[in-house]
């Protein structure tokens, strides 16, 4: 048996998806014109930082790229970054790689991702399209911290694999 990350399309309540622009993740309206990323999600094997109240411990990566989401402090503020890293390398580490870890919690049918390194900081999208995905403490109207994970594998013949691999233009504002 070989562990493998699960694949999801991700969107928020305003139907904005995540798009790779260079080495940054930005939010863009779900559209024929953009190619959304497929999120790779895999559970962390090390239980050091486990907290079931906060959710499952997961690593997040971008499918088809050796890129993973991680959190670091920049000028005193927790910041969401993409780092060149294979998600399976993180998974295979015996010790949890804290900067790359997120608590994945379900709120109804939506998902919330909280940084393990910076408790109370959540992955968010702005209500304005073309803005980077970021970390916020402000949950609510302006910042969307609730996401819908749409399964890419199986899924009743959704044809998502074909759609995502089709030729799309890269997002630009």
């Amino acid at each position: 048996w070989q562990a493998a990350p699960k694949s999801y399309a991700i969107r928020d309540s305003r139907q904005m998806v995540w798009v790779l622009s260079g080495n940054s993740l930005i939010a863009a309206p779900l559209s024929n014109r953009v190619k959304p990323v497929t999120l790779h999600l895999i559970t962390c094997r090390d239980t050091e930082f486990s907290d079931k109240k906060k959710g499952n411990l997961v690593y997040l990566g971008i499918r088809g790229k050796d890129l993973c989401l991680f959190c670091e402090e920049i000028q005193g503020k927790p910041t969401l970054q993409l780092k060149e890293k294979n998600i399976m390398d993180l998974y295979m580490e015996k010790k949890a790689q804290k900067p790359f870890l997120f608590f994945h919690n379900k709120e109804g049918s939506s998902s919330v991702f909280q940084s393990v390194s910076y408790p109370g900081w959540f992955i968010a999208t702005s209500s304005t399209s073309g803005q980077p995905i970021f970390l916020t403490q402000e949950r609510g109207i302006t910042n969307n911290t609730n996401f819908y994970l749409d399964s890419v594998e199986g899924g009743g013949g959704s044809g998502l694999n074909d759609i995502f691999e089709a030729q799309k233009i890269e997002w630009h504002e």
Partner: antibody
Framework: ELQLQESGPGLVKPSETLSLTCTVS??????????WGWIRQPPGKGLEWIGS???????YYNPSLKSRVTISVDTSKNQFSLKLSSVTAADTAVYYC??????????????WGQGTLVTVSS | ESVLTQPPSVSGAPGQRVTISCTGS?????????VHWYQQLPGTAPKLLIY???NRPSGVPDRFSGSKSGTSASLAITGLQAEDEADYYC???????????FGGGTKLTVLG
């Protein structure tokens, strides 16, 4: 081939609740990445989106109708339904159910029911 | 008042080309959400004519085409035929409303 069929009373009294059901055939209401919607069309007028529900159970409602609308899914019957409370004559319309797929129709509706006329009158 | 604005009516003779405009705002078409077009023949349900701004579902003749620029979109019909006489609606998604929006509809009359 996916098909949708609306059903429900054609006459509703003012102040009562309008209830309609859309039966899905040729596909599953729980199909991944699918959303289901209700749209209405008053006689001689244009289309108005009422609300939608998707395969995750998330609901989205027209702000102008939100306080009166409930959309729900019955997976065992492969149906989704609309309830519109406190109706008035202004709610008289042909009601359509429709569907689309997030990553294939990009928030458009590619399959529609034939529509059912609901008249609000005492 | 519709969120998306369309002309109430357009007309053309058989064989001619007509266009129908659809004007939105920065929270729908201008926010890069796609525009879809529907054809509604008299007494029938709407039918998807164009999706994702400029894509035709299978079975829709290539006489129908869509385009989008800025906060507006348009539907073009070339080689107009009598059976094209119908109402046409544009539709998009509005993030400020967190919902789907339609244009008011345009009645196409084929003259003669």
């Amino acid at each position: 081939e996916l098909q949708l069929q609306e059903s429900g009373p054609g006459l509703v009294k003012p102040s009562e609740t309008l209830s309609l059901t859309c039966t899905v055939s040729g596909g599953s209401i729980t199909a991944s990445n699918t959303y289901w919607g209700w749209i209405r069309q008053p006689p001689g007028k244009g289309l108005e989106w009422i609300g939608s529900i998707d395969y995750t159970g998330s609901t989205y409602y027209n702000p102008s109708l939100k306080s009166r609308v409930t959309i729900s899914v019955d997976t065992s019957k492969n149906q989704f339904s609309l309830k519109l409370s406190s109706v008035t004559a202004a709610d008289t319309a042909v009601y359509y159910c429709a569907t689309g797929k997030y990553y294939e129709t990009y928030l458009g509706f590619d399959v529609w029911g034939q529509g059912t006329l609901v008249t609000v009158s005492s | 008042e519709s969120v998306l604005t369309q002309p109430p009516s357009v007309s053309g003779a058989p064989g001619q080309r007509v266009t129908i405009s659809c004007t939105g705002s920065s929270s729908n078409i201008g926010a890069h959400y796609d525009v879809h077009w529907y054809q509604q023949l008299p007494g029938t349900a709407p039918k998807l004519l164009i999706y994702g701004n400029d894509n035709r579902p299978s079975g829709v003749p290539d006489r129908f085409s869509g385009s989008k620029s800025g906060t507006s979109a348009s539907l073009a019909i070339t080689g107009l035929q009598a059976e094209d006489e119908a109402d046409y609606y544009c539709q998009s998604y509005d993030y400020s409303l967190s919902g789907y929006v339609f244009g008011g509809g345009t009645k196409l009359t084929v003259l003669g």
